[in-house]
């Protein structure tokens, strides 16, 4: 097979017969040495599936439940072109599964038992795979066969395809279960007239299910949707309450040796050459053959999907919950409103070892996940592999563009017994240099810097933001001469004073001797010119308090702060000198697990938090000799967020914004994925 | 500082017993927490078993009901009794007290623990 062939699956003869259409069309718009189609026909998509796990076939366009299947081991394959629908500045490749109920009902998502309820049709993602599958926990036992669960669940129905005879309580709204639009109740907009009928009481749906069947706002007004925490919201707010996200169609590759590059460059060149209205003679989104022919025909174009995204990423933690409950039919055997244990995800083997020391004394409440980035672990958590780490305001952001929210401040200022309740203010980012240098904020250029990390909020986003709106460009790495930034790219100038050693050079962990806050001032005590931190970095490093050979000689008065205004001030003065105030750091989980983890870090806190004083024979939460593993060394308790429960709110508007500008010099994988 | 010193390991057949020692330098009374690691070859060093001053215990899942930690704090002392061993028991093991030296990577020499037939 040559290098620069795509092998696509056909699973029809209809499909085998468009996709030799598209070989031959493609071949006459591509250059000889551009990428070409093949075509294998197999009986079946999952047939396709196993044919290019087994590169006997490079891609082939999927259903999400078939994604699921692709994913699945021994298959391992990935998305890496999305179909999109609407139009080419507002594309849509998600759609979302929501449940809507009438407003004036007052009941939430955990007490659907005996009502009645209206589906779009039996075996169908948004009505009913998605809802079902969420709750197939609550359902009645057995829970098989399920229809008879769901029967003995919902106090009536109407799922239109299911069989009547069987199961009358499923047909009690829609008599018969009709499986096409003579059922009144049928499909989407059947299952929504279900419900304005008064026939049902919550219908399963897409998002846009409501705004096509009501064109009036007020008319819409009349409806709220579910959310799966047990409140409800306008049905404008789909994106922040709904049961999953659900892709639409989607292009799979092999995770390893996939051909992505070159799939996507033949794709992208197929919809310039033969997209929406391009050509006659051929058309990607249509065939005489039949319909939805290898693509769909109500697919408008393809986008590349993120290289960070994986299929669990992509399907998202409710998807395969839904999809993985209804396959597996596996239910945890503790109730589901009793908290299991916390997995906290741990950056690398150093706080991997603080992490296993805190579960083994907290009897198991908390259990420990490892992962190489700060990113890794928040993908982590998306997917449930992990349940909640601490974070820095920067990687708050970002974990808050990835649907986690804040659920507790690490408080550095206040002390006990008030800190559990107090909102603190944040402490400074700052600028330290050496007291015997002439360097000021104005005079940077060309010098020798030292951050935390790429997207921590001292160490990069606030200096890096101050500085982006002075030079205008993302460039940073030809600003400054040379520095450490670990989680740059690892032949730019940014990694070339990091001290590693050599395979963790640069990398945003503590196996890098130059990450964190002791890493950066270190690096400014060894090699740097300047060094972003907290306000609160040199006087912890000073005065013999870090015993490491590195600093036990440091003094505080050798280190001054930058200010802004050009001038220069002792380290006693970051109230009076400093970049700007940082939010403190916060504790991020799914909204699905937030109250557990708040309830159960409030209750580890009293036995392991700042009220031991000795922790030379003790576990302390909040010590690590410097090392700021897992949580700042200098907490004094993870305080209640009260209302600031959203990222934007903990953070505040005016470092969003300041975020959001940097966004254009993002190297995030995953904030990229995040916002697809 | 207690050093500490780990012993007991050898080669054993898949199904065996063996069990490890690691002797402190100093009491271990004052020492809240100890465990067992251990690194495979060309893996990272993981979680065997722990162990607090309390008698909590904690397990990695893959040797759950084989092994059995315990600590004996008048002989300053901690132990790994490992039961129907497997050739991916196969590895180094390490003893660790947590303190902060192991932030540092300052680890023992460990024992070699190989399962072979």
């Known amino acids: 097979v040559p290098e620069k062939s795509v092998r696509w699956c056909a699973v029809s003869e209809h499909e085998a017969t468009k996709c030799q259409s598209f070989r031959d069309h493609m071949k006459s718009v591509l250059p000889s040495n551009g990428p070409s189609v093949a075509c294998v026909k197999k009986a079946s998509h999952l047939d396709c599936i196993r044919a290019i796990a087994a590169n006997e076939a490079d891609a082939v366009t999927l259903d999400a439940g078939l994604v699921y299947d692709a994913y699945l081991a021994p298959n391992n394959l990935k998305p890496v072109v999305a179909e999109f629908y609407g139009s080419k500045e507002d594309p849509q490749t998600f759609y979302y599964a929501v449940a809507v109920v009438k407003k004036d009902s007052d009941f939430q998502m955990n007490q659907l038992r005996g009502r009645k309820s209206c589906h779009t049709g039996l075996g169908r993602s948004a009505g009913w795979n998605i809802p079902i599958g969420l709750l197939y926990c609550d359902l009645p036992e057995p829970r098989k066969p399920l229809e008879k669960a769901v029967a003995n669940f919902f106090s009536g129905s109407c799922v239109p395809c299911a069989d009547g005879t069987d199961f009358p309580q499923l047909c009690q709204l829609c008599p018969g279960c009709g499986c096409s639009t003579l059922n009144q109740y049928f499909s989407y907009s059947g299952a929504f007239k279900c419900l304005k009928d008064g026939a049902g009481d919550v219908a399963f749906v897409k998002h846009s299910t409501i705004f096509e069947n009501l064109a009036n706002k007020a008319d819409r007004d009349q409806y709220e949707l579910l959310c799966l925490d047990n409140t409800r919201k306008s049905v404008d707010e789909y994106k922040d309450c709904h049961l999953a996200r659900v892709p639409s169609h989607t292009v799979v590759a092999r995770s390893v040796g996939g051909k992505e590059d070159l799939i996507w460059e033949l794709l992208n060149q197929a919809q310039e050459h033969f997209g929406k209205d391009k050509s006659k003679e051929f058309q990607l989104f249509s065939s005489p053959h039949g319909k939805d022919l290898l693509f769909k025909d109500s697919a408008h174009g393809f986008l590349k999907v993120p290289p960070r995204m994986d299929a669990k990423m992509y399907l998202g933690y409710e998807y395969i919950t839904a999809i993985r409950n209804l396959r597996e039919g596996t239910c945890p055997e503790a109730p589901t409103d009793e908290c299991k244990p916390v997995k906290w995800c741990a950056l690398s083997h150093h706080e991997r070892l603080k992490c296993d020391e805190w579960s083994v004394n907290s009897a198991g409440k908390i259990e420990c996940e490892s992962a190489e980035t700060t990113e890794d672990c928040i993908a982590k958590i998306m997917n449930g592999e992990a349940d909640a780490m601490s974070l820095d305001g920067g990687f708050v952001y970002i974990a808050g563009m990835c649907g986690l929210v804040p659920v507790l401040a690490e408080n550095y200022n206040t002390p006990n017994p008030n800190c559990e309740n107090t909102a603190e203010e944040g402490y400074f980012a700052v600028a330290v240099v050496k007291s015997s240098s002439d360097l000021t904020w104005d005079n940077l250029k060309g010098k020798k810097s030292c951050h935390t990390a790429v997207g921590r909020t001292a160490g990069w986003n606030i200096p890096m933001g101050l500085l982006y709106s002075k030079i205008n460009h993302c460039r940073f790495d030809e600003f400054f001469s040379e520095g450490c930034a670990p989680g740059s790219e690892k032949n730019s100038s940014l990694c070339k004073l990091c001290m590693g050693p050599s395979p963790n050079l640069c990398e945003p962990n503590n196996k890098e001797g130059y990450y964190g806050y002791t890493g950066a001032f270190r690096c400014l005590v060894e090699k740097g010119d300047v060094a972003f931190v907290k306000h609160q970095t040199v006087p912890q490093n000073t005065g013999g308090k870090n015993p490491d050979a590195w600093a036990k000689n440091l003094k505080e008065e050798d280190y001054e702060l930058l200010c802004l205004d050009g001038s220069r001030k002792s380290v006693q003065e970051p109230a009076n000198c400093h970049l700007a105030r940082a939010p403190n750091h916060a504790v991020v989980a799914r909204k699905d697990k937030a109250d557990c983890v708040q309830t159960l870090l409030l209750d580890q806190q009293r036995m392991f938090g700042s009220s031991v004083t000795d922790c030379s024979s003790n576990f302390c939460l909040f010590e690590s000799k410097t090392k700021d593993l897992l949580f700042r060394d200098d907490t004094v308790c993870l305080a209640k967020l009260h209302d600031r429960n959203t990222y934007e709110k903990y953070l505040g508007e005016e470092y969003v914004k300041a975020v959001t500008n940097l966004r254009k010099c993002s190297t995030s994988p995953l904030l990229e994925a995040c916002t697809f | 500082q207690v050093q500490l010193v780990e012993s007991g390991g050898g080669l054993v057949q898949p199904g065996g017993s063996l069990r490890l020692s690691c002797a402190a330098s100093?009491?271990?009374?004052?020492?809240?927490?100890m465990g067992w690691y251990r690194q495979r070859p060309g893996k990272q060093r993981e979680l065997v078993a722990a162990?607090?001053?309390?008698?909590?215990?904690n397990y990695a899942d893959s040797v759950k009901g084989r092994f059995s930690i315990s600590r004996d704090n008048a002989k300053n002392t901690m132990y790994l009794q490992m039961n129907s061993l497997k050739p991916e028991d196969t590895a180094v093991y390490y003893c660790?007290?947590?303190?902060?030296?192991?932030?540092?990577?300052?680890w023992g020499q460990g024992t070699q623990v190989t399962v072979s037939s």
């Open positions: 100093g009491s271990i009374f004052s020492i809240n927490t």
């Open positions: 660790t007290d947590y303190s902060r030296r192991y932030y540092q990577d300052d």
């Open positions: 162990i607090t001053r309390g008698g909590n215990t």
